[in-house]
Interface confidence: medium
């Protein structure tokens, strides 16, 4: 690495993966290991971080990227970066501080993560309830009670939703 | 850099039609809840309701049901917030955030506050 | 619905330690969050889940729980600390994901 030059801040010249050393004349040195610095002119790089227990390693620390953490099978990510790991339940169940439990009555989770929402209220929108909901599912609506004939069509389910509220992996 | 920009202030007399809104960027806008937070003067924070644009439900606060539309044009990324005839109680600030849920319910994002000022 | 519990205010020496609650039923089923409003700001998610700290949130402020009441501590209280902090949860008596948030509490550092 070559010493920089600039007369205004002689570190702006050090590039991402290195950081300006003070101790060595502001010479640009090379991030040691496990460390990063994304950005160039940095004055220290920083420490990556690691995936330990249930986090495990999406994307390695490079010498100018931070290490990407996941959650190991039966968790799910929380939170900006996923700094937090959260069990996975079943459908038809929610997390609480007790762990899973059963949706009550009158609400879903298709999901294996999220929260238990009410039911589809279908005559609301002037329909009937074609399929009647469960635990792991909404409930289907159909036409209205008037607009059903032998020649009706049939009506297909809705596509399950996103998993709501949590953060994409 | 993920933020949510809201709307600029508002002055409006009692009686007439407003809508506000929140524009979320730098995330995948389709997989959080957006929940709307009002702050009266001088008070603390009150939830309004939210959509989830995943599947465009909405869920509000029983005591803003009917007194507020909350919707959202997926297409670009924006909640929106609206009245159809403001009264004077409605001086607030409104607040648009991001919420998750999980063993609990967790605002990690918030827009900027959009003052709604009504008064004749 | 149920209700979240909060002093309305506490004040702390700076440099010392102070803890903040907020009670409710639904803290028995789900973890409260916490925020940081100061004048003419948006809040700021302190704490949520099971004593998480978002980042750049300093570890001088903690949360813990016991049965329906939850903790926010500051130790260390520091000038900028000063504030209002409100918690916040979900609503156990309702089929519906609904959201309660405490009155707040309005922390003056001497």
């Known amino acids: 690495f070559e010493r920089t030059r600039s007369l205004q801040d002689p570190c702006s010249n050090c590039p991402a993966g290195t950081f300006c050393d003070n101790n060595r004349n502001q010479i640009c040195s090379p991030c040691p290991p496990n460390s990063f610095s994304s950005a160039g002119g940095q004055r220290t790089c920083d420490i990556c971080r690691q995936c330990k227990g249930v986090f495990r390693t999406r994307k390695e620390c490079s010498s100018t990227s931070n290490a990407e953490c996941d959650c190991t099978p039966g968790f799910h990510c929380l939170g900006a970066g996923c700094s937090m790991c959260e069990q996975d339940c079943k459908q038809g169940q929610e997390l609480t501080k007790k762990g899973c439990k059963d949706c009550c009555f009158g609400t879903f989770n298709d999901q294996k993560r999220g929260i238990c929402r009410p039911w589809t209220n279908c005559s609301l929108d002037g329909k009937s309830v074609l399929v009647n909901g469960t635990k792991e599912r909404d409930v289907v609506c159909g036409p209205s009670p008037a607009d059903l004939s032998p020649g009706a069509s049939s009506v297909t389910p809705p596509a399950p939703a996103r998993e709501p509220g949590h953060s994409p992996q | 850099q993920m933020q949510l920009v809201q709307s600029g202030a508002e002055v409006k007399k009692p009686g007439e039609s407003l809508k506000i809104s929140c524009k979320g960027s730098?995330?995948?806008?389709?997989?959080?809840?957006i929940a709307w937070v009002r702050q009266m003067p001088g008070k603390g924070l009150e939830w309004m309701g939210m959509f989830y644009p995943g599947d465009s439900k909405t869920t509000y606060n029983p005591s803003f049901q009917g007194q507020v539309i909350i919707s959202a044009d997926k297409s670009i990324n924006t909640a929106y917030l609206q009245w159809s005839s403001l009264k004077a109680s409605d001086t607030a600030v409104y607040y648009c955030a991001r919420a998750f849920y999980a063993a609990g319910n967790y605002f990690d994002y918030w827009g900027q506050g959009t003052l709604v000022t009504v008064s004749s | 619905s149920s209700e979240l519990t909060q002093d309305p205010a506490v004040s702390v020496a700076l440099g010392q330690t102070v803890r903040i609650t907020c009670q409710g039923d639904s803290l028995r089923r789900y973890y409260a969050s916490w925020y940081q409003q100061k004048p003419g700001q948006a809040p700021r998610l302190l704490m949520y889940?099971?004593?998480i700290r978002p980042s750049g949130i300093p570890d001088r402020f903690s949360g813990t729980d016991s049965g329906n009441t939850a903790f926010l501590t500051i130790t260390g209280a520091q000038a900028e600390d000063e504030a209002d902090y409100y918690c916040?949860?979900?609503?156990?008596?309702?089929?519906?994901?609904?959201?309660?948030f405490g009155g707040g509490t309005k922390v003056t550092v001497l």
């Open positions: 916040n949860s979900r609503d156990t008596n309702a089929n519906q994901p609904l959201v309660l």
């Open positions: 730098g995330y995948n806008f389709t997989n959080y809840f």
């Open positions: 889940g099971k004593n």
